[in-house]
Interface confidence: medium
């Protein structure tokens, strides 16, 4: 009796092999797909990290894309100087030169007449004169007492450049822009043979109900904390220090049942601003029990411990902490490289290969 296969059987074997191959390829593809969720309180740097991914892994912003940010740069600059001027009234700070009071009213009128994406020479002149004023500078130095964009000084110090009629924002200008994220922004890129899907989520508490239940099957969570927020008050809730708000959110994420098998990566961000602030504002503003010195290293290490101690499953869950400056492309590149290695290692572990 011969053991030759009929044409029908051969086709069935081929089909079976093809199914196996497809399953294997699907499995490999799934293993190469990385779903990253960016979480953190408002203005902690999540969207800046996303912008960095575009710069590092997608050849950055084209000239055309940069041009589209011009209106945001102008809006951020104008909002910043207006926030400082308004705060002067509340903090009872006088202008160094009384003639600046005229400029302040002129600012409001000109800003209200400004066309989006344009800055007239007179508006630029008014802002420049105000920014140079000693009273305005004194108020700027007390910015922890009111809400001010982190990028305020960056743009205001560079007004001569950004007010040029032919101004095109640079990659760094784009990185520094502040637009409140509403809803969920998805970004895709490939790195180290992995296909990343990164989800940027609005940090303000009003946004949280939109995403908290949606993200099972996430490979890793990058949780951003603004280190420099230790002496600020939360915008939506004047009662709670921003750092404590951030800790509360981290606690709820880190110990959430949906994220039991999810790697938690902690970005202690804005380390550059923190390093400057800690020289002037003691950490006891945020942590009255802190007895260490107000050096960058010791204060930063203390904040790191405060967050890592919130992890209730220390035996089974590791938190991977990095100190970051989201506006520094080299720093983000280095950190993200390390993060990817952790993800690869954990993926191999899940497949029993490590």
């Amino acid at each position: 009796m011969g053991c030759t296969l009929s044409a029908e059987d051969k086709a069935a074997v081929e089909r079976s092999k093809m199914i196996d191959r497809n399953l294997r390829e699907d499995g490999e593809k799934a293993a190469r797909e990385v779903k990253l969720l960016l979480l953190g309180a408002g203005e902690s740097g999540k969207s800046t990290i996303v912008k960095q991914m575009k710069i590092i892994h997608e050849a950055g912003y084209s000239e055309e894309e940069c041009k589209q940010y011009k209106a945001v740069v102008y809006s951020n600059t104008i909002q910043s100087i207006i926030a400082i001027i308004r705060a002067m009234g509340r903090l009872k700070i006088d202008f160094g030169d009384s003639a600046r009071a005229d400029d302040a009213r002129q600012l409001f009128v000109l800003a209200g007449a400004a066309e989006e994406g344009f800055m007239t020479a007179e508006l630029a002149g008014v802002i420049k004169r105000l920014w140079k004023d000693s009273g305005v500078q004194a108020c700027f130095n007390r910015s922890r007492e009111y809400q001010l964009n982190d990028s305020a000084a960056y743009y205001l110090n560079d007004l001569d450049r950004i007010a040029q009629p032919n101004y095109i924002p640079t990659q760094q200008d784009v990185l520094r822009t502040r637009v409140k994220t509403t809803g969920i922004v998805e970004t895709h890129f490939t790195f180290k043979d992995l296909h990343f899907k990164m989800f940027d989520v609005g940090g303000q508490r009003s946004e949280r109900k939109k995403w908290i239940h949606c993200f099972e099957g996430v490979t890793a969570i990058i949780f951003c904390v603004a280190l420099s927020d230790y002496d600020l008050v939360l915008a939506e809730d004047e009662e709670m220090n921003r750092m404590h708000e951030s800790m509360k959110l981290f606690d709820s994420i880190c110990n959430n049942k949906w994220f039991t098998d999810t790697s938690i990566i902690l970005f202690l961000n804005k380390k550059d601003l923190f390093e400057e602030k800690i020289k002037k504002s003691p950490l006891t503003i945020c942590y009255p029990e802190y007895a260490g010195s107000n050096t960058y290293e010791e204060a930063a290490a203390y904040i790191q411990c405060q967050f890592e101690d919130l992890n209730k499953r220390k035996d089974t869950k590791e938190i991977y902490t990095h100190f970051t400056c989201a506006t520094d492309t080299k720093n983000v590149q280095f950190v993200f490289d390390a993060v990817t290695d952790v993800i690869i290692k954990n993926n191999l572990k899940d497949c029993g290969l490590f």
């Epitope: 207006i82 009128v109 209200g112």
Partner: nanobody, 120 residues
């Protein structure tokens, strides 16, 4: 539709007086801080004076302080600028404008302006 219509501009001799008016419609005038702004030939816009929504506080630019008086009548939806001791430097097109509600993106409303000429 928001409308601001200025009137009262004229040719006047140095040292003379004028009273400008601005009739507002299409918005709740009584809730807006209002401004007078001027533009001299070949020059940029210059803020002149402002008045709070209920007329309690007023502000003046340095060059006009003590000579100009801003006032309003919310029952008539009208803004005024009394100009005394006029100088050649005061010659300009005078506009009334709302204070911008969100401070940016073309949120202030402007009138078409009224011409003030100061000459002997």
């Amino acid at each position: 539709e928001v409308q601001l219509v200025e009137s009262g501009g004229d040719l006047v001799q140095p040292g003379g007086s004028l009273r400008l008016s601005c009739a507002a419609s299409g918005f709740t005038f009584s809730t807006y801080r209002m401004n007078w702004v001027r533009q001299a030939p070949g020059k940029g816009l210059e803020w002149v004076a402002s008045i709070s929504s209920r007329g309690i506080t007023t502000d003046y630019a340095h060059p006009v302080k003590g000579r100009f008086t801003v006032s309003r009548d919310n029952t008539k939806n009208t803004l005024y600028l009394q100009m005394n001791s006029l100088k050649p430097d005061d010659a300009a097109v005078y506009y009334c404008a709302t204070d911008p509600s969100t401070w940016y993106r073309g949120t202030a409303h402007w009138g078409q302006g009224t011409q003030v000429t100061v000459s002997s």
